[in-house]
């Protein structure tokens, strides 16, 4: 026969019970918590140190970009993509059109210090969009030339240059003096590139990838 | 990792936390209702308040649940 | 709504319902604790037993409130 | 040595156009470069008025756009000014010169220059 | 366009002294700036191109420097021959213009 437990001991054992529950409780809830904070705070830090990081980027670029036009890539509300205010954007790049009048050093000088190159064309869509925003009686010069006069033309960024995507004039490159290239117009043939001396001032075309923030 | 994966990552810990308590209690519920029947078998119905009790308490929360 | 704010809303929800339910499942546990334990008493005391739990249950309820 | 020369009259009456000639020698205007005209009013201030390139063609500064035409003679290896409805404003000492020396850093070869006097 | 202010506009020096004269471009030229003498009834000559780079012929006793939107031309133990008008000119974007003038007279 199982000795009968005395009611004190009995209400002593509910008590560390009841305790232990509440114990369990109290620990499940302050896990709970932890993870609803981490998920609260953690994305609100993450957003602030991408806010810091976005900031500091976008002071990389004030000097010479004082506005961004940014528009959200996909349906992440993280990325944006941008390109200075006057700039034009196509696919991942931004262009400008330079209606100075500069030789092609300083002309890609004066792209350099804006962050960017003289433009580098690398399909015909690309030329097909940038030419709906050049006047036909301008020349602008390109990220294309060649330095030595050996015909081995090279773009600034060190794409490799691919005769198959070319757009010359016809009977163009024609004279090994001429070390540079411009996109103009001709009636005859509509937009395409010529060789010409690169000291002689053009207008200039700019191109630099979209700033991601 | 990137904020919204974190966050789908929670969701996922407090789903399954969810799951696994409604299933806890649930069995516990069982077991409470099925102890409440033998003891009124045995008892002459000494449990039936606590079982009425505890069936309010879970109709409650039917109401009450938030709709997933 | 976009797809994270939607998902920070989840995450309330999961949350609530996940306190909720662990309160009620200790609550389930210590009732059927002292169900158990006020079985062993003599019949005409049963409800005592019942009615005093029922008052500790509802105190516990209200210090182990989490704050909002 | 490339040689520059320039030519026209040194009258020009208010209203009518003055036109300069820039005879080059020792290098063809066809060959590169751009062709320039510049000119220096009697306090001294200089002025780029605006080039013709070895291709043909031409920039011009914008205070003179719509007055101002530069041409050339491939054959004779000369290029021309032309600027119309001329003031007493005009007075100056028109020089040519090639421009695109040194990476486009500075006007290497100059004309001697002509004195032109706008008056009545 | 940018605009060339030159100072200063007149100097008076003595054969032997260093001289020299400044010229600041209203925005960044990045070097591209040149230096010309000239002497009355005469056509300007180059001296300097690119900020520091001296033409060939041109006496070392010259010397260009700066950077961004200030530039000097600096003249060591002047000589006779050094008399004259001297003019700065950027040639960073077309028009290219040139500064005042700095006439430097014999002391």
């Known amino acids: 026969m199982v000795p009968e437990e005395e009611p004190q001991d009995r209400e002593k054992g509910l008590w560390w019970f009841q305790l232990k529950v509440w114990s369990m409780a109290v620990v499940s809830i302050l896990l709970l918590s932890v993870c609803f904070t981490v998920s609260s705070v953690v994305p609100h830090n993450f957003m602030y140190s991408k806010t810091v990081k976005r900031l500091s980027k976008l002071r990389e670029y004030q000097q010479y970009h004082p506005s961004l036009t940014c528009v959200m890539e996909g349906k992440d509300i993280e990325d944006w993509s941008c390109c200075p205010t006057p700039w034009t954007s196509f696919q991942s790049s931004c262009y400008f059109i330079s209606t100075g009048m500069q030789s092609w050093t300083k002309s890609q000088k004066n792209c350099s210090v804006m962050g960017a190159d003289l433009v580098v064309i690398n399909t015909r869509e690309e030329q097909d969009f940038i030419i709906q925003n050049l006047k036909r009686n301008s020349s602008y010069f390109l990220g294309l030339s060649d330095p030595g006069g050996r015909r081995h033309w090279q773009w600034v960024d060190q794409t490799p240059y691919n005769e198959n995507v070319t757009f010359w004039h016809s009977g163009e490159p024609n004279n090994l003096d001429e070390r540079c290239a411009i996109i103009n117009f001709r009636s005859s043939e509509e937009w395409g590139w010529n060789d010409i001396h690169c000291h002689v001032p053009q207008k200039s075309i700019c191109k630099m990838k979209k700033i991601y923030i | 990792l990137g904020e919204p994966q974190l966050c789908y990552i929670l969701d996922a810990i407090l789903f399954l936390y969810g799951i696994v308590l409604t299933l806890l209690y649930c069995r516990l519920k069982i077991q409470v209702r099925k102890a409440a029947i033998t003891s009124y078998e045995k008892s002459d119905g000494v449990y039936t308040g606590l079982s009425t009790r505890n069936q309010e308490t879970y109709e409650t929360l039917k109401h009450e649940k938030p709709p997933q | 709504l976009g797809e994270p704010q939607l998902c920070y809303i989840l995450d309330a929800i999961l949350f609530l319902y996940g306190i909720v339910l662990t309160l009620l499942y200790c609550r389930l546990k210590i009732q059927v604790r002292k169900a158990a334990i006020t079985s062993y008493e003599k019949s005409d005391g049963v409800y005592t037993g019942l009615s005093t739990r029922n008052q500790e249950t509802y105190e516990t309820l209200k210090h182990e409130k989490p704050p909002q | 040595d490339v040689q520059l020369q320039e030519s026209g009259p040194g009258l020009v009456k208010p209203s009518q156009s003055l036109s300069l000639t820039c005879s080059v020698t020792?290098?063809?205007?066809?060959?590169?470069?751009?062709w320039n005209w510049i000119r220096q009013f009697p306090g001294n201030k200089l002025e780029c008025m605006g080039y013709i390139t070895y291709d043909g063609s031409n920039n011009y500064n914008p205070s003179l756009k719509d007055r101002i035409s530069i041409t050339r003679d491939t054959s004779k290896n000369q290029f021309f000014l032309k600027l119309n409805s001329v003031t007493t404003e005009d007075t100056a000492t028109y020089y040519c010169?090639?421009?695109?020396?040194?990476?486009?850093?500075?006007?290497?070869?100059w004309g001697h220059g002509t004195l032109v006097t706008v008056s009545a | 366009d940018i605009q060339m202010t030159q100072s200063p506009v007149s100097l008076s020096a003595s054969v032997g002294e260093t001289v020299t004269i400044t010229c600041r471009a209203s925005?960044?030229?990045?070097?591209?700036l040149a230096w010309y003498q000239q002497k009355q009834g005469k056509s300007p000559q180059l001296l300097v191109y690119?900020?520091?780079s001296l033409v060939d012929g041109v006496p070392s006793r010259f010397s260009g420097s700066g950077s961004g939107t200030q530039y000097s031309l600096k003249i060591n133990s002047l000589q006779p021959e050094d008399f004259g008008s001297y003019y700065c000119?950027?040639?960073?974007?077309?028009?290219?213009?040139f500064g005042g003038g700095t006439k430097l007279e014999i002391k």
């Open positions: 000119q950027h040639f960073w974007i077309i028009p290219y213009t």
């Open positions: 925005g960044n030229i990045h070097n591209y």
């Open positions: 020792g290098y063809s205007i066809t060959s590169g470069y751009y």
């Open positions: 690119n900020a520091k």
């Open positions: 010169a090639r421009g695109g020396d040194y990476d486009d850093g500075g006007f290497a070869y």
